[in-house]
Amino acid sequence: SAHAHPRDSCPLGPGRCCHLETVQATLEDLGWSDWVLSPRQLQLSMCVGECPHLYRSANTHAQIKARLHGLQPDKVPAPCCVPSSYTPVVLMHRTDSGVSLQTYDDLVARGCHCA
Amino acid sequence: SAHAHPRDSCPLGPGRCCHLETVQATLEDLGWSDWVLSPRQLQLSMCVGECPHLYRSANTHAQIKARLHGLQPDKVPAPCCVPSSYTPVVLMHRTDSGVSLQTYDDLVARGCHCA
């Protein structure tokens, strides 16, 4: 097809475009100190940065969105940087019956793209 | 668990929060006039609007992001409005050997959430 291909080089300069960044957060930051027991400090990988035209387009829809944003910036928003995949996280937390270890699949980003 | 639940009422007023909106686009708008033959006008559903705290959170990661954005707005971006699902679209387009009908699964948004 004649679809435009997503590009991976950032035209805005280093660190400006959509990428994964680690944010340190405590259970207090997250409001979780009443139910999560461990880990007490979390390494939260999040997606940050801008999505210039066709940069890391998630799919055809994102390419269309980028194109239409160029034509109608007031009506169509630019694509934005969101997780493309996640890393499982094991939390030790309270339950009604005691304490449990549970894996959460949608908590920490592993990769990012522009959607 | 003690996770905050995503909320569905928009605190910003009607039409301001993340929702699905239809945008009319021609093949020329999309740069597709040289390879797509039909339809010549597309009804493109896109996700637009803001993502206030916990509005239509996609998952736990989005809830965390909303919380940390409140604490560190310069470092952590707010969640943004992106497709949660897509509607398949059939396009008639040129191929090397003639004309083909093809279904595209990631072209038009069907639902939106804040990620």
Epitope: T22, Q43, V89 | -
Partner: antibody, heavy 119, light 112 residues
Framework: QVQLQESGPGLVKPSQTLSLTCTVS??????????WTWIRQHPGKGLEWIGA???????YYNPSLKSRVTISVDTSKNQFSLKLSSVTAADTAVYYC???????????WGQGTLVTVSS | DIVMTQSPLSLPVTPGEPASISCRSS???????????LDWYLQKPGQSPQLLIY???NRASGVPDRFSGSGSGTDFTLKISRVEAEDVGVYYC?????????FGGGTKVEIK
């Protein structure tokens, strides 16, 4: 079922660097909340926490060993490694790798490998 | 670092009888969330340590219910309600409240 296996030389000369690798099987090393840990046990003695690493590469070291320890992770090989520099006879020990939730709950351990520091 | 002290050093036991090991920390292990950050491990002869109890009183997966942990603050106890021959080995307490985690010196449990 997660399994851990230490590997590396059993004999290291004084002043050299001790290098051990722990291979994780039966599960991914790339999980948040998990600290991949090194613990040692001097002959006939108790246990000493050396340090740990998260899948992201963040490291945590025992202050008593910090100046000599480096722990690294290779997610593509599902392995993490320990390097202990400038070893002396006092570093002779059985070295264990283990999986913990942060600094606790070491629920999976390697079988341990004896490293002797001697010329 | 938090210092962990175990007693007794050695504990001869009779199969079928109860046994008790004490562990004391140099500062309170009680977190503001109400949990005591203390683990218990058993190292059987020639084996790696195995987790018995975490957060003071929670039995790890697969651990028989004859093992129980109790205590709060600075004083903790591991109890075996009825000792079996397979329970012999060295028992360690470990504080997990703050880094570095530190272990007690161990209590050797052996059959009389």
């Amino acid at each position: 079922q997660v399994q851990l296996q230490e590997s590396g030389p059993g004999l290291v000369k004084p002043s050299q660097t001790l290098s051990l690798t722990c291979t994780v099987s039966g599960g991914s090393i790339s999980s948040g909340g998990i600290y991949w840990t090194w613990i040692r046990q001097h002959p006939g003695k108790g246990l000493e926490w050396i340090g740990a690493i998260a899948y992201s590469g963040s490291t945590y070291y025992n202050p008593s060993l910090k100046s000599r320890v480096t722990i690294s992770v290779d997610t593509s090989k599902n392995q993490f490694s320990l390097k202990l520099s400038s070893v002396t006879a006092a570093d002779t020990a059985v070295y264990y790798c283990a999986r913990g939730i942060e600094y606790q709950h070491f629920d999976y351990w390697g079988q341990g490998t004896l490293v002797t520091v001697s010329s | 670092d938090i210092v962990m002290t175990q007693s007794p050093l050695s504990l001869p036991v009779t199969p079928g009888e109860p046994a008790s090991i004490s562990c004391r920390s140099s500062q309170s292990l009680l977190h503001s969330n109400g949990y005591n950050y203390l683990d218990w491990y058993l190292q059987k002869p020639g084996q790696s340590p195995q987790l018995l109890i975490y957060l003071g009183s929670n039995r790890a997966s697969g651990v028989p219910d004859r093992f129980s942990g109790s205590g709060s603050g600075t004083d903790f106890t591991l109890k075996i309600s009825r000792v079996e021959a397979e329970d012999v080995g060295v028992y360690y307490c470990m504080q997990t409240l703050e880094a570095p985690p530190t272990f007690g010196g161990g209590t050797k449990v052996e059959i009389k």
